[in-house]
Interface confidence: low
């Protein structure tokens, strides 16, 4: 049976899937607030452009009867249940916002023919790459692998004079949704990261990780992990660490490093933190009042999803083009739109580009300092601190393999 799209005659709707399983354990009220704030901005922008149209959101709630674990790993069917709800109601907006879980998104793509665009705050996994009508507004795993490979190969910076080709990856299976898929992409034999490295080993047990820190026979000095400093401390504690160990802590969606008066704990001295620069204006936003530093990015992605919808609506209406066409469904990519916190760029496959930031702990000030930034759009590393006050010898990052002997 055909589902009619509420997407014509001056009335345009975005369907927002409100799933119990989401990439971040964020109360649905906060997501609703973000969507509503976005709608207000969109209405204003359309009005300013002389487009007298109605824009609304319809929230589709999962009843939680079948899938109520609140865990993305069990979310495969929930997205399909919600799609069936849409099908039964025979009503759909111009755009579908959600789901955020990789399994849900992947399954929805397998089991449905999506003739409308889908915007996701999440869907981090490689299995959601290259989907023609999917737009992802939080950095997917593919972008992380590009950064890591780029950084591993870099050998022409004052603080990094060795190319790296090896790594350990710590992955114990208890990670958050974003970390789970980021680490999966590093672990997978099919991934860019795996294929550019000559050695990579996944450490799955706490003891394996702890042993490597002082193992003279270790195959790499570099360990990639994902989580926040507290997660690292629970694992590493105050254990001694060999002087040429480098831990890369992936913590993309955490603004805490940039907050005033933050001091880096001692156990972070051997650690480089990969994160993203925060959006200052979001901190004062009405809907962010209840958001922790790690949740702002998720809420912002929902808000930006609404703004993207508004941007595409404006573009198509100004050009006199039909909204319910395959052209519209495939248009949410290769563009820049005005997001809540400044311009947002989407790549050729509809994935958000961002500036990743690599931080180190200054041994002088015990503060987090920016070592370099990385622009995912142009795959380029830009050094920021040419004379970092590192813990490592000669204030340079060590070789990834100790005592290689004559090269």
């Amino acid at each position: 049976s055909q589902v009619s799209q509420n997407c014509h005659n001056g009335s345009y709707e975005i369907s927002v899937l409100m799933m119990d399983n989401s990439a971040f354990a964020e109360p649905l009220e906060n997501v609703e607030d973000a969507v509503n704030e976005g709608l207000e901005i969109v209405r204003g922008r359309l009005q300013n452009a002389g487009l007298n149209v109605t824009v609304n959101a319809s929230f589709m709630y999962s009843d939680g009867l079948i899938h109520n674990s609140g865990d993305c790993r069990s979310s495969t069917c929930e997205g399909l249940d919600l799609l069936r709800k849409i099908s039964n109601a025979k009503r759909m907006g111009c755009v579908l916002m959600g789901p955020s879980c990789t399994y849900s998104t992947f399954q929805m793509y397998l089991d449905t023919e999506l003739s409308y665009p889908m915007i996701s705050a999440g869907s981090f996994g490689l299995s959601c790459d290259y989907k023609e009508t999917l737009t992802r507004l939080m950095s997917p795993a593919r972008k992380l692998t590009y950064f890591l490979v780029n950084f591993w190969k870099t050998n022409d910076l004052p603080f990094k004079t060795y190319s790296w080709s090896t790594s350990y990856v710590y992955k114990n299976g208890t990670e958050s949704e974003d970390c789970f898929w980021y680490l999966n992409a590093l672990e997978a034999s099919v991934s860019y990261f795996s294929h550019e490295l000559s050695f990579k080993l996944v450490l799955r047990q706490d003891k394996e990780f702890q042993d490597i820190l002082m193992d003279h026979n270790r195959k790499s000095n570099v360990i990639v992990m994902c989580g926040d400093p507290e997660f690292l401390y629970k694992l590493k504690g105050d254990r001694a660490v060999a002087e040429d160990i480098v831990i890369i802590l992936v913590d993309l969606f955490n603004d805490q490093y940039f907050e005033d008066n933050v001091t880096a704990p001692d156990y972070m001295k051997n650690v480089l933190v990969l994160t993203q620069s925060p959006g200052n204006s979001l901190l004062n936003s009405s809907f962010s009042r209840n958001l922790s530093p790690t949740k702002r990015d998720f809420a912002l992605a929902y808000l930006n999803g609404i703004l993207l919808f508004g941007h595409m609506l404006k573009t198509f209406l100004e050009n006199g083009e039909n909204i319910t066409t395959p052209k519209f469904a495939h248009a949410f990519r290769n563009l820049t739109f005005e997001g809540y916190d400044g311009p947002v760029t989407l790549d050729d496959w509809g994935d958000v580009d961002s500036t990743m930031v690599l931080l180190y702990t200054s041994v002088d000030t015990k503060k987090y300092k920016v070592l370099l930034t990385y622009d995912t759009h142009v795959n380029q590393t830009n050094p920021v601190d040419m004379s970092p006050t590192f813990t490592w010898k000669n204030s340079k990052l060590p070789n990834d393999i100790t005592d290689r002997g004559p090269q």
Epitope: D129, N184, A188, V190
Partner: antibody, heavy 122, light 110 residues
Framework: EVQLVESGGGLVQPGGSLRLSCAAS????????MHWVRQAPGKGLEWIGE????????NVHEKFKNRFTISVDKAKNSAYLQMNSLRAEDTAVYYC???????????????WGQGTLVTVSS | DIQLTQSPSSLSASVGDRVTITCRAS??????????LQWYQQKPGKAPKLLIY???KLASGVPSRFSGSGSGTDFTLTISSLQPEDFATYYC????????FGQGTKLEIK
């Protein structure tokens, strides 16, 4: 039509060396990883190693690392397997094959050469 | 390396029979909801030919009588109705971590 054609096989004495070639045609050579797989008479398939033609990155199975080297010549659209210190147990048909990665992230050998026989015997 | 063990090692069957070959991995070959396991057919003097990829997806040009199933560590190749041209050796292969093959299952005419 995508084609892989191996050459360079033959009879070689134990301790000797041999260089096998794999000429690729019908596709963009630098876009696909190239692999070498061998099969001893009456036995199963054994992966030797792989090379990324675009940048020459190689991964060779531990078992062969000290004796076998994989290389490419992009100008000739060819991959090579240099085999040194050959032993009787290296007697096998050697195949080159490429991997394709689908957009869903699946990775497998989709095209194979016809194979070339290497016999190590005195 | 991930070890793959096929059973049986050899099998006699007749045209029209339904045949099942199994492949067991020493550890899971699953990755984001799919299994990185392939099945190949090889005839004497010929190179292997891809039949099934990702455990259950039929390769281009392969007859629908071939099907694959399984996940994690246990996989099955089924030929629903044997044809004369199906008598060959079948190999499973994983691409989850590097590349390894099963030892092969030789399918012979009864």
């Amino acid at each position: 039509e995508v084609q892989l054609v191996e050459s360079g096989g033959g009879l070689v004495q134990p301790g000797g060396s041999l260089r096998l070639s794999c000429a690729a045609s019908g596709y963009t050579f630098t876009s696909y990883w190239m692999h070498w797989v061998r099969q001893a008479p009456g036995k199963g398939l054994e992966w030797i190693g792989e090379i990324k033609p675009s940048n020459g990155l190689t991964n060779v199975h531990e078992k062969f690392k000290n004796r076998f080297t994989i290389s490419v010549d992009k100008a000739k659209n060819s991959a090579y397997l240099q085999m040194n210190s050959l032993r009787a147990e290296d007697t096998a048909v050697y195949y080159c094959t490429r991997t394709i990665t689908t957009t869903e992230g699946y990775w497998f050998f989709d095209v194979w050469g016809q194979g070339t026989l290497v016999t190590v015997s005195s | 390396d991930i070890q793959l063990t096929q059973s049986p090692s050899s099998l006699s069957a007749s045209v029209g029979d339904r045949v099942t070959i199994t492949c067991r991995a020493s550890e899971s070959v699953d990755y984001y909801g799919s299994s990185l396991l392939q099945w190949y057919q090889q005839k004497p003097g010929k190179a292997p030919k891809l039949l099934i990829y990702a455990a259950s997806k039929l390769a281009s040009g392969v007859p629908s009588r071939f099907s694959g199933s399984g996940s994690g560590t246990d996989f099955t190749l089924t030929i629903s109705s044997l044809q004369p041209e199906d008598f060959a050796t079948y190999y499973c292969q994983q691409t989850r971590k590097a590349y390894t093959f099963g030892q092969g299952t030789k399918l012979e005419i009864k």
